[in-house]
């Protein structure tokens, strides 16, 4: 929907979990509500408990089975309902078609880790997490160093198009301080967008050898 | 966007059964959720019944459920309101709605509205 007030948006992290926002202005705060989602072609149905996060906000994970069990498909279609209990009966709040493998936000990438490192350089090495066996080789990622002195936001995106799951960085400073994120996102998708930032990982450049210059 | 445009109204006796059509147009039809909604003479609009374009699920009004019918046909890009048992309190101009990405998350917020087609229902 245009209007920004309410939206009902949900992402499938390709292999077993649908996570779901509600926003909904002038909402009651202490209303049960929940997300049921409904499978045109499966014999199982999901519940989960919107909580909120925030004054007009609410959100739940549907859990689909094991993490890395592939619990949908390309052609799968989930009808979502959020349902707020109004005295004995739940009222339908809001409804979608969700098509899975169009609203994909995978999981970030995990098990950061230095490879090697030099003076003006370093090599780390990443893993995706739950990620569909679906998308063979078609991923990208951003990456995004964290230099002295500056923010995350201020930090230049370096783009891998393809499923590389390690980067060399260059022309570091000798001796210093960083902090490195990677996120990924499929290429498959309309609505697809990209994980969440990966836990930093902290690493420090090698001294400059005393005599040499730098 | 999307364009929508109501047909089917007219004066019909109490007792008496109706269907409205809506023809949609535009690009993100095929994943949009469909709606009625009603709105008498000096009152506000009303939700009437929603209709998902994939799946055919449907939610309705309390005041409709059980005497009105919200189908599409996904080959002409239409969605109907089947209305039977109609009550005066039915009278109104009915409005065809389109909500689509990112959906809304209250079914009476829509993107697309067409201009309504009045039903009068006299006894």
């Known amino acids: 929907a245009v209007n920004g007030t309410s939206q009902f948006t949900c992402f499938y992290n390709s292999r077993a979990n649908i996570s779901c926002v509600w926003s909904q202005d002038g909402a009651l705060q202490d209303t049960s509500c929940q997300v049921h989602a409904w499978p045109d072609r499966r014999r199982w149905n999901q519940t989960c408990e919107l909580l909120p996060v925030s004054q007009a906000s609410w959100a739940c994970n549907l859990i689909l089975g094991a993490p890395d069990s592939q619990k949908l498909t390309t052609v799968d279609i989930v009808t979502l309902r959020v349902l707020c209990r109004e005295g004995v009966r739940w009222r339908v709040m809001a409804i979608q078609d969700f098509k899975p493998f169009e609203n994909l936000r995978l999981m970030a990438p995990i098990s950061l880790q230095v490879v090697h490192v030099e003076t003006h350089r370093c090599n780390i090495s990443w893993e995706i997490s739950q990620a569909s066996h679906y998308f063979e080789r078609h991923l990208e990622f951003e990456a995004r160093t964290l230099s002295p002195g500056h923010t995350w936001e201020e930090a230049p995106l370096l783009t891998l198009k393809q499923k590389q799951e390690w980067i060399c960085l260059e022309t570091l400073t000798p001796d210093t301080q960083y902090e490195f994120q990677v996120r990924v996102k499929p290429l498959q998708g309309e609505f697809t967008t990209w994980s969440p930032w990966s836990q930093p990982l902290a690493f420090r450049t090698k001294p400059a050898a005393l005599g040499k210059d730098t | 966007q999307v364009q929508l445009v109501e047909s089917g109204g007219g004066l019909v006796q109490v007792g008496d059964s109706l269907r409205l059509s809506c023809a949609a147009s535009g690009r993100t039809v095929g994943s949009a959720n469909m709606g009625w909604f009603r709105q008498a003479p000096g009152k506000e609009r009303e939700f009437v019944a929603v209709i998902t374009w994939s799946t055919g699920s449907t939610v309705y009004a309390d005041s409709v459920k059980g005497r009105f019918t919200i189908s599409r046909d996904n080959a002409k890009n239409t969605v109907y309101l089947d209305m039977s048992s109609l009550k005066p309190e039915d009278t109104a101009v009915y409005y065809c709605?389109?909500?689509?990405?990112?959906?809304?998350?209250?079914?009476?917020?829509?993107?697309?509205w067409g201009k309504g087609t009045l039903v009068t229902v006299s006894s």
């Open positions: 709605a389109a909500d689509v990405y990112p959906y809304s998350g209250n079914l009476n917020i829509m993107d697309y």
